[in-house]
Interface confidence: low
């Protein structure tokens, strides 16, 4: 779509005569008829295929034509077309004499024609005017013309439609060739796709307007590149949404169980070595000269029975001294001057000669030890008591004295808050670090399953991976209690299992 524009500039008819040679009376009141049509090698009569236009009376005999375009007038003349401009044309301009005010062809005298010119040729679309002048025997016409595209049409043939817009169809302006030029922040064939905030994660973020970064569920941060950990995750992180991967030394579903009591609390005294043995549980290995659960008690150096072969120990300021029985000598009475002939083996031990009778060795019966079978076996030397329990010898047997919160032969059992069956209506009891928790059967809720519920949000089995479902009465929604190894509001995400504990 475009417009052929014709600007009439000057018409000369000095003698004021018609084409027939007859003079106009009183002068030639001149108007023009213009015909624009397709290219013809010889411009012939026929329909004006590209359009026609007529002017009012512009002057008498010879006159210059005012440019009326700024005032909305008829010069330049406009010949619009709604097709692709072919690049060639034929133009016919007729000058006519109007004796009266009626300019209709049927109202004019038969010989009212003053002059007629016809041109044809090539014309490219452009802003520049082509100036031309046509002369006949009695008249001269000076004019210029051009072809320009209509609003919203572009290109060499005015065939490319482009209408700038900033709406759902697109966000663009038009280049001189009709191609789209996206407004800042938009992209795509029709400039309909917003350009998200720079760095916005391709998978985890999206945008509905430029420079925006909206996060998909499970992601957060300005660029949607930070995962959201499981709700309640205390000492843990995530690499995918709803995870809770525990920091070193922490365990449990929410990474809130202290597995590194030694590092976090340093309970062992006097340079003892601390070993973690479970949640909030540890064992201290004392340095020589110390004892107690936390190695807080100083030992007499004789408490370790350093004197052998029945030697007696005496504490001294700078250590200890062994008083050896007859037949023994050395720092710890470890050397013997006896042989099997001296019956050195006590408590039924049998004597075996060594080194041709210069020495001997005792083979001790059960429950006795020492080079002369003089010592009862101490069943506590192997530290059998767990969780900091104290080992006590009781004749032929031994027993463990447990720290508060532990029980069992070897203090290996955590004292259970669940022992008194506190959960009502068949609820399952779970020991926690700071108390207990009841998992209620369908239809019951409350801290001890004591409340009967009317709406069972768990009826649809919303929890995955054999998680326990229970109803939150305040919101009529369900909560999933995940087994170890799973997280998420429906326990749908697997995680690495935390270390197992000894209780």
């Amino acid at each position: 779509s475009g417009v052929f524009q014709l600007q009439l500039q000057e018409f000369i008819n000095e003698r004021g005569v018609l084409a027939s040679g007859r003079p106009c009376e009183p002068g030639c009141r001149t108007f023009f008829r213009v015909c624009l049509k397709h290219f013809q090698a010889v411009v012939s009569p026929g329909p004006c295929t590209f359009g026609t236009v007529s002017t009012p009376v512009l002057g008498t005999n010879s006159f210059a034509v005012r440019d009326d375009s700024s005032g909305g007038g008829r010069n330049p003349l406009q010949l619009p077309f709604n097709f692709t401009w072919p690049g060639t044309f034929s133009l016919i301009i007729e000058a006519w004499h109007a004796p009266g005010d009626d300019l209709r062809p049927e109202a004019l005298p038969p010989d009212a024609l003053i002059s007629k010119i016809a041109i044809q040729g090539s014309l490219a679309v452009g802003q520049n005017w082509l100036l031309d002048e046509q002369t006949s025997t009695l008249t001269r016409l000076r004019y210029s013309y051009r072809v320009i595209c209509s609003d919203n049409y572009y290109g060499d043939n005015c065939s490319r439609l482009c209408k700038k817009r900033n709406d759902h169809f697109g966000h663009y302006v038009c280049q001189p060739d009709g191609n789209l030029s996206c407004l800042p922040g938009w992209t795509g064939e029709y400039c309909q796709q917003p350009i998200c905030l720079s760095g916005c994660h391709e998978q985890n973020g999206y945008c509905s307007k430029p420079a925006e970064c909206l996060c998909r569920p499970g992601w957060q941060g300005r660029l949607c590149n930070e995962c959201i950990p499981h709700n309640g995750c205390r000492h843990g992180t995530c690499s995918t949404p709803w995870q809770c991967t525990c920091d070193e030394g922490w365990g449990g579903l929410f990474c809130d169980q202290d597995l590194n009591y030694c590092t976090h609390h340093s309970p062992c005294k006097n340079g003892a070595t601390c070993s973690n043995s479970g949640q909030r549980s540890y064992t201290c290995t004392c340095r020589p000269g110390y004892t107690g659960v936390d190695c807080e008690l100083e030992l007499s150096e004789c408490d370790s029975n350093p004197c052998r072969n029945g030697g007696s120990c005496k504490d001294q300021e700078d250590g200890y001294h062994c008083l050896c029985p007859p037949g023994y000598y050395g720092l710890h009475c470890e050397h013997s001057t006896l042989s099997c002939a001296d019956s050195p083996c006590f408590n039924g031990g049998s004597c075996r000669e060594r080194n041709q009778g210069a020495n001997y060795a005792c083979e001790c019966p059960p429950n006795f030890t020492g080079s002369n079978c003089e010592k009862k076996v101490d069943r506590c030397t192997s530290n059998p008591c767990a969780n900091g329990g104290q080992c006590l010898n009781r004749g032929p047997s031994r027993m463990c004295r447990c720290r508060p919160g532990f029980t069992g032969t070897y203090c290996e059992l955590h004292v259970s808050d669940c022992a008194r069956n506190p959960c009502a209506h068949g609820g399952t009891c779970h020991d926690l670090e700071n108390g207990l928790m009841c998992t209620c059967p369908a239809g019951f809720s409350g801290r001890r399953c004591e409340v009967r519920t009317s709406i069972d949000a768990c009826a649809s089995s919303p929890c995955f991976n054999r998680a326990t479902c229970y109803t939150d009465l305040s919101t009529d929604t369900f909560v999933c209690n995940c087994p170890y190894g799973f997280v998420g509001s429906r326990c749908e995400f697997p995680v690495g299992l935390p270390p197992s504990f000894p209780w």
């Epitope: 439609l161 759902h168 169809f169 029709y190």
Partner: antibody
Framework: EVQLVQSGGGLVQPGGSLRLSCAAS????????MHWVRQTIGKGLEWVSA???????YYPGSVKGRFTISRENAKNSLFLQMNSLRAGDTAVYYC???????????WGQGTPVTVSS | DIRLTQSPSSVSASVGDRVTITCRTS??????LAWYQQKPGKAPNLLIY???SLQSGVPSRFSGSGSGTDFTLTISSLQPEDFATYYC?????????FGQGTKVEIK
């Protein structure tokens, strides 16, 4: 009552051409964007082309260069010229109006196009 | 092109049931989504536009929700005349695209 009445469907051989028409009534046709949508057994509903109030046209890649949408506001008419037809163009074609909020409503009654040798 | 994925592809339900159909888009489209109902041999009929706006003349048992990439059509109490195929349409950007359809059948 707003109405869209379609015509011009039928059987055509592969590589052939067909022109679909849609006559609008009950509303000021020149003020609305118009669309063609087709429905195939295999691919379901598929948008084929659109023409704006200023005559601006839009096509998906599957028909670009083969289909031409046009309108004649003076006659309240919408057209779809389909050239170089393929078997995959076999469908029921609907002409659809959309207004300032860009929602497809109402739809014509549909016209079947079968491309087969 | 923006892809639309409807689920489920079909659902069997009884009169009075609550039926929910979801439509997920491959990229964010704000609220520029519509829902259509189509019965055999008929043209599609607009139910919901702009994700949640009820088209004039459509019963209030139909409702829509969602924005961005996840959208839902809900029929609160299924009526005999509601057994049909339902389509979602994104009108955010060219080319406009439809979901593959969800058929609601009588159980």
């Amino acid at each position: 009552e707003v109405q869209l009445v379609q015509s011009g469907g039928g059987l055509v051989q592969p590589g052939g051409s067909l022109r679909l028409s849609c006559a609008a009534s009950g509303f000021t046709f020149s003020m609305y964007d118009m669309h063609w949508v087709r429905q195939t057994i295999g691919k379901g509903l598929e948008w084929v082309s659109a023409i704006g109030t200023a005559g601006d046209t839009y096509y998906p890649g599957s028909v670009k260069g083969r289909f031409t949408i046009s309108r004649e506001n003076a006659k309240n008419s919408l057209f779809l010229q389909m050239n170089s037809l393929r078997a995959g163009d076999t469908a029921v074609y609907y002409c659809v109006r959309s207004g300032t909020t860009e929602w497809f409503d109402p739809w014509g009654q549909g016209t079947p196009v079968t491309v087969s040798s | 092109d923006i892809r639309l994925t409807q689920s489920p592809s079909s659902v069997s339900a009884s009169v009075g049931d609550r039926v929910t159909i979801t439509c997920r888009t491959s990229q964010g489209i704000s609220s520029w989504l519509a829902w259509y109902q189509q019965k055999p041999g008929k043209a599609p009929n607009l139910l919901i536009y702009a994700a949640s706006s009820l088209q004039s003349g459509v019963p209030s048992r139909f409702s829509g929700s969602g924005s961005g990439t996840d959208f839902t059509l809900t029929i609160s109490s299924l009526q005999p005349e509601d057994f049909a195929t339902y389509y979602c349409l994104q009108a955010n950007s060219f080319p406009y695209t439809f979901g593959q359809g969800t058929k609601v059948e009588i159980k």
